[in-house]
Interface confidence: medium
Amino acid sequence: IIPVEEENPDFWNRQAAEALGAAKKLQPAQTAAKNLIIFLGDGMGVSTVTAARILKGQKKDKLGPETFLAMDRFPYVALSKTYSVDKHVPDSGATATAYLCGVKGNFQTIGLSAAARFNQCNTTRGNEVISVMNRAKKAGKSVGVVTTTRVQHASPAGAYAHTVNRNWYSDADVPASARQEGCQDIATQLISNMDIDVILGGGRKYMFPMGTPDPEYPDDYSQGGTRLDGKNLVQEWLAKHQGARYVWNRTELLQASLDPSVTHLMGLFEPGDMKYEIHRDSTLDPSLMEMTEAALLLLSRNPRGFFLFVEGGRIDHGHHESRAYRALTETIMFDDAIERAGQLTSEEDTLSLVTADHSHVFSFGGYPLRGSSIFGLAPGKARDRKAYTVLLYGNGPGYVLKDGARPDVTESESGSPEYRQQSAVPLDGETHAGEDVAVFARGPQAHLVHGVQEQTFIAHVMAFAACLEPYTACDLAPRAGTTD
Amino acid sequence: IIPVEEENPDFWNRQAAEALGAAKKLQPAQTAAKNLIIFLGDGMGVSTVTAARILKGQKKDKLGPETFLAMDRFPYVALSKTYSVDKHVPDSGATATAYLCGVKGNFQTIGLSAAARFNQCNTTRGNEVISVMNRAKKAGKSVGVVTTTRVQHASPAGAYAHTVNRNWYSDADVPASARQEGCQDIATQLISNMDIDVILGGGRKYMFPMGTPDPEYPDDYSQGGTRLDGKNLVQEWLAKHQGARYVWNRTELLQASLDPSVTHLMGLFEPGDMKYEIHRDSTLDPSLMEMTEAALLLLSRNPRGFFLFVEGGRIDHGHHESRAYRALTETIMFDDAIERAGQLTSEEDTLSLVTADHSHVFSFGGYPLRGSSIFGLAPGKARDRKAYTVLLYGNGPGYVLKDGARPDVTESESGSPEYRQQSAVPLDGETHAGEDVAVFARGPQAHLVHGVQEQTFIAHVMAFAACLEPYTACDLAPRAGTTD
């Protein structure tokens, strides 16, 4: 399909002249950020961004690539180097430490410098690094964590936890020897390390004692509480704050977010990770956009401002399954949340960053015609005289041999939400990729987001923009928090 | 390998504070660019940039990812949307039209709006679009084209040619019917469409009549002249300019570049594309860095300034072969040329842009240890109990089945320059990828390079920065050309 309009050079020249005009008008704000939002697309490499743009555009009956994601509208872009201290290709724990605490760590550790060693409890103490969220709280701001994964997952945990093993969700996951050495599970740290005003996502089962039935799945024992210490962490958290409210479904969330008596809100909507957006029961579970809106309603009451972490955490899971349909629909919901947040906040006082922790070995090739489905087939056949999809993975569970050969694929098969794109190497889970990821920035001090940077730079930009430790002498006016 | 200094949070905090300090000091220059340089890494997607950074770092005995490419030092970054009017995933012809002329075209056409149709000669006339190089020449600047491909290849041709078929290198490649309709081959257009001061690269055979032996390979008939019209285009070009010089080897190039009587220089160092850097005969053929230096020596004599196109054109070819070794070593030489150009020019008066025309379905995954070879194996085994490489392709010629199964691979095999990384789908040539590519910018008006842009924006930024058509009323001081 060749759009008639695009045949005319004037179309492109006019469009570029407008873009130039907008670029010339960009004025770096010299003010501090009252509010900080970091949107984290877990596994959202540049190939995911582009494919999601096309899909989102096509869902609006456009050809696709000419449209804009919400994040595309952010005026400043940088590239972020994601390696961890010990690996070229990182995990979500070490990267969370980088972009939330400003220090690089080791693979599968969280909130700890690289002096800590994976799974070695005794290397924890003294190596803790403090997140920007924690520093924002100390400065009198309200803070929140929103994710589509469990709230104890690696990325959100970077905002509040310190652990040598990202998999220590509840005490049942922590070896007895480590528990004896004083290493706490992530769920315990969620409620005890710092005061978090808003906590929204999945992860109910890690908060309740073993044997506690789940309210949504009371007959499914595997979904119930997992804790061995007999603690009801939700109860403990509620007891800390007079205005605290715990919710576990969408209806309760929407009510609580509008209730002025609620000062602290914890919403845990699934026992583990939240459901993929395409599987979500919209009567029971809120979308990421709805959780983001609820968080902003609460947090924005604070005249000193807020810090909010919003994660599209299951983009990564879709890719690990080699199911691009899931990864890309998750990315679109993530982008919808960014868009909604933009409507609810002002770029005059809110620094918003969008980034990824790492990429995936996910590619989009094959010379497909403009307007053709992102999940479709490439024109022509492969060397084995079979069709192939435009989306493919370097490695992952999509690798299958059928009668000693690569399976053929039809357009209807490849368009299925369950379809796993083929890969070069068979793995149970497709892996992360190590290339640089994009950082998109808007708001006060967003102009500092430039060039190629270490991933740690992100945390430092946020801290500087809001005049938080170690940048309290930031020399920005109006100083953060002057509105109270 | 965990570097001891990186275990200390102070290392990361100090580094980030320095980066913040540098970011705060960035001052958008309000002056015009006297000179324009566009460095085009053909097929150099973000995954290629990161992998090349690691390789270049390791060649300097560093761990890799913590090091800097020359392009990494450019202060401004944007993302460029590379689709062509008719394809989600473009080719180098349509993209060259975008970043050199500022207008998007159709797949495999060059220097024409999308009203032109591939291979249909009669759709050429009236649909020509004019490159920034051409506009620079009209403004009195000197102009040059440097590439590791043949100089008539798609990317450089975007600077001077208008053709409905990128493969029409010489008249022997143009169907008789199209010749009769008046469609000219690219080699002819190279010498007749505009006055180009410096032309360096490959592509000798397209300039000489059929039967003319090649000076380097006189006994290889397939490397000799291909022209059917009996023309010696080099002779015709030399006759146009009193100070014109033609060279075909490195020694002659170095001599000519230092000769003040040479005003125009054409150097064609191979019959077709230049050799891969790893195959280059350094006594006969110059490197991309050397060609770039020679071009800058000549062009910088013009007090009105210059426009220079420098292409690392065989990054793309390495990827098409699924030979990452070739692609990445080409990228390093490309980066070396960027570095050398930076030493020979000033960012006070020279706008330098680095970008790619498109990406490739090339990925870097598998959780390798820091410091391990980029060409090495991932830790552990795949589901088929065989080793696999960290570098892989979505599709391409690296797909092989051995006895109905994926072949095993050893570290020594994967480290070979000839090794083809495995792919999910078997193709004769690995394909381009459609995700956004990076644009790196330095110099006057580089700050305009921001956010997510159409690829066409690149040409417009260059034109605006140097006050060329259609931005002659650019209102920048000092105005371009005031130094003559």
Epitope: I1, V4, E6, F11, K62, L63, S373 | -
Partner: antibody, heavy 123, light 106 residues
Framework: EVQLVESGGGLVQPGRSLRLSCTAS????????MSWVRQAPGKGLEWLAL??????????EYTASVKGRFTISRDNSKSILYLQMNSLKTEDTAVYYC??????????????WGQGTLVTVSS | DTQMTQSPSSLSASVGDRVTITCKAS??????IAWYQQKPGKAPKLLIH???TLQPGVPSRFSGSGSGRDYTFTISSLQPEDIATYYC????????FGQGTKLEIK
Amino acid sequence: EVQLVESGGGLVQPGRSLRLSCTASGFTFTDYYMSWVRQAPGKGLEWLALIRNKATGYTTEYTASVKGRFTISRDNSKSILYLQMNSLKTEDTAVYYCARASFYYDGKVLAYWGQGTLVTVSS
Amino acid sequence: DTQMTQSPSSLSASVGDRVTITCKASQDINKYIAWYQQKPGKAPKLLIHYTSTLQPGVPSRFSGSGSGRDYTFTISSLQPEDIATYYCLQYDNLYTFGQGTKLEIK
């Protein structure tokens, strides 16, 4: 040149069904989105239904007022667009137009229209 | 669903007058708006799409502008043959027409 010719209109009683056709020529039918739009006497235009092209699997969309009663379909071998209208109401009285979208840069604007066919629903 | 509010519903003007019609969308429609002219007994005719792009053969006295939610259609110098009803159409999210503006000569 692009031509769209609607047929099948006429007088029909409330509660009954009617099928409209739109015969297309002058373009590759399968490449384009097709829509039905109606205009009640003396009133404005109302978009009713859309059927997408081959590349997007011929998926359909409807405006709320006709969803469940009207069905858009296409016979690609004959280049004919259909609108099956069931459980007709008096308020469905209108001139019915078929329209073809054009893929400009900006999406799916309704660029080509038929001359319309009048449907009168009355007892 | 995106709603389009078109105003005025009717207007009377003299030949040579500058005429302006506005459409307001219920949400940002990203410039995806078209303007149509319809004469009695005829099908609508596309004049402008993507806010401001004139269809081939449409006189240059017709123009469009706007962004976000607010859009304007202008006839710079009204001609007798311009007497018709004009509709806006958003096509950002499926399709929605404005209510129409009936243009008459004074």
